[in-house]
Interface confidence: medium
């Protein structure tokens, strides 16, 4: 018992949010302010993220979690943990390196990110063109020809629910 | 380095025609915008236009639509703005800026300036 | 166009002294604001963008803060080379359009 103690880290009972500090003979030491340590056994707290400039503060650090940034209005996150803010564009544009460019004929983007999108080809499911596409929005297929004919319904029934966890049959 | 060295200071008459330069370096002038900023004597400054040199795509501010025209050439990496028919009203100094535009880090600024060109008309 | 309008257009102070200078946009701008400043006989040089971000190499005692129609710029400290004239420039629309400028003066 006395052997395997001795073999212990003294470390590994510091618990997050503290750091083992070699030079007060690897106490448990809180972890200085704009610091934290997420996990027990650090043997240093690791420096807060600071949400600067275009980034602001979606999550204030604490001694046992970092920092969560989020962007600024106008702004939206990019990457791992919002690693980078990127511009919004209006709906109806997307972003290039030249800046927010409008979606070009026959295609639309319907949210501030991302980029420009194809009007969807109601002809390749049979439909037709019910409401057109804008920059905005995407086209709005309806029933096709031949389900408008005389005596047709135009309204298509609803396929029958499946129960959730089984296979159809 | 980044930087943007304009031409030398002119005096013109009215009636004149004239084309200032700014030359720039320390990055792909292709890849960004650059516009023109007017300073009238103890004024404040006035965006002109601006002119993304990968393909010539110009937009103009209402105010100097018409009365200058932006151009640039790849070749030398040099943005150039030109007035056909110069008035004593154009007396100002004229600065251009790389236009840091649509990036990552923030909106469209103007990052990288030239260091004027003195523009005098007088008869 | 959107206008611009800054305050006060000219003020005296201290070196020492915090300096606070406000910008109001025509119509809500979100954070495209930028910061200048200028000195006699040079060019403009960017201090501040997207409303609070401080350009690389500026100074510290230089913040920005603001969103929609009402920003600020502050000097925490004035030094003697921040004597200058500064604009504040809305980058949100097409033509981008400039306040009139406030001149920092030395008391």
């Known amino acids: 018992f006395e052997r395997t103690r001795s073999l212990q880290d003294p470390c590994s009972n510091c618990p997050a949010g503290t750091f083992c500090d070699n030079n007060r003979n690897q106490i448990c030491s809180p972890c200085p302010p704009n610091s934290f340590s997420s996990a027990g056994g650090q043997r240093t707290c690791d420096i807060c993220r600071q949400c600067k400039g275009v980034f602001r503060t979606r999550k204030e650090c604490s001694s046992t979690s970092n920092a969560e940034c989020d962007c600024t209005p106008g702004f939206h996150c990019l990457g791992a943990g919002c690693s980078m803010c990127e511009q919004d564009c209006k709906q109806g544009q997307e972003l290039t390196k030249k800046g927010c460019k409008d979606c070009c004929f026959g295609t639309f983007n319907d949210q501030k990110r991302g980029i420009c999108r194809p009007w969807t080809n109601c002809s390749l499911d049979g439909k037709s063109v019910l409401v057109n596409g804008t920059k905005e929005r995407d086209v709005v297929c309806g029933p096709s020809p031949a389900d408008l004919s005389p005596g047709a319904s135009s309204v298509t029934p609803p396929a029958p629910a499946r129960e959730p966890g089984h296979s159809p049959q | 380095e980044v930087q943007l060295v304009q031409s030398g200071a002119e005096v013109k008459k009215p009636g004149e025609s004239l084309k200032i330069s700014c030359k720039v370096s320390g990055y792909s002038f292709t890849n960004y915008w650059i516009g023109w900023v007017r300073q009238m004597p103890g004024k404040g400054l006035e965006w002109m236009g601006i002119?993304?040199?990968?393909?010539?795509?110009?937009r103009y501010s209402p105010s100097f639509q018409g009365q200058v025209t932006i151009s640039a050439d790849k070749s030398i990496s040099t943005a150039y703005l030109q007035w056909h028919t110069l008035k004593a009203s154009d007396t100002a100094m004229y600065y251009c800026?790389?236009?840091?535009?649509?990036?990552?880090?923030?909106?469209?600024?103007?990052?990288?300036w030239g260091q004027g060109t003195l523009v005098t008309v007088s008869s | 166009d959107i206008q611009m309008t800054q305050s006060p257009s000219s003020l005296s102070a201290s070196v020492g002294d915090r300096v606070t200078i406000t910008c109001r946009a025509s119509?809500?701008?979100?954070?495209?604001l930028n910061w200048y400043q200028q000195k006699p006989g040079k060019a403009p040089k960017l201090l501040i963008y997207a409303a609070s971000s401080l350009q690389s190499g500026v100074p510290s005692r230089f913040s920005g803060s603001g969103s929609g129609t009402d920003f600020t710029l502050t000097i925490s400290s004035l030094q003697p080379e921040d004597f200058a004239t500064y604009y504040c420039?809305?980058?949100?629309?097409?033509?981008?359009?400039f306040g009139q400028g406030t001149k920092v003066e030395i008391k």
């Open positions: 002119i993304y040199p990968g393909d010539s795509d110009t």
């Open positions: 420039q809305q980058s949100y629309s097409t033509p981008p359009t």
């Open positions: 119509q809500s701008i979100s954070s495209y």
């Open positions: 800026a790389r236009h840091q535009g649509y990036s990552f880090s923030g909106s469209h600024i103007d990052d990288y």
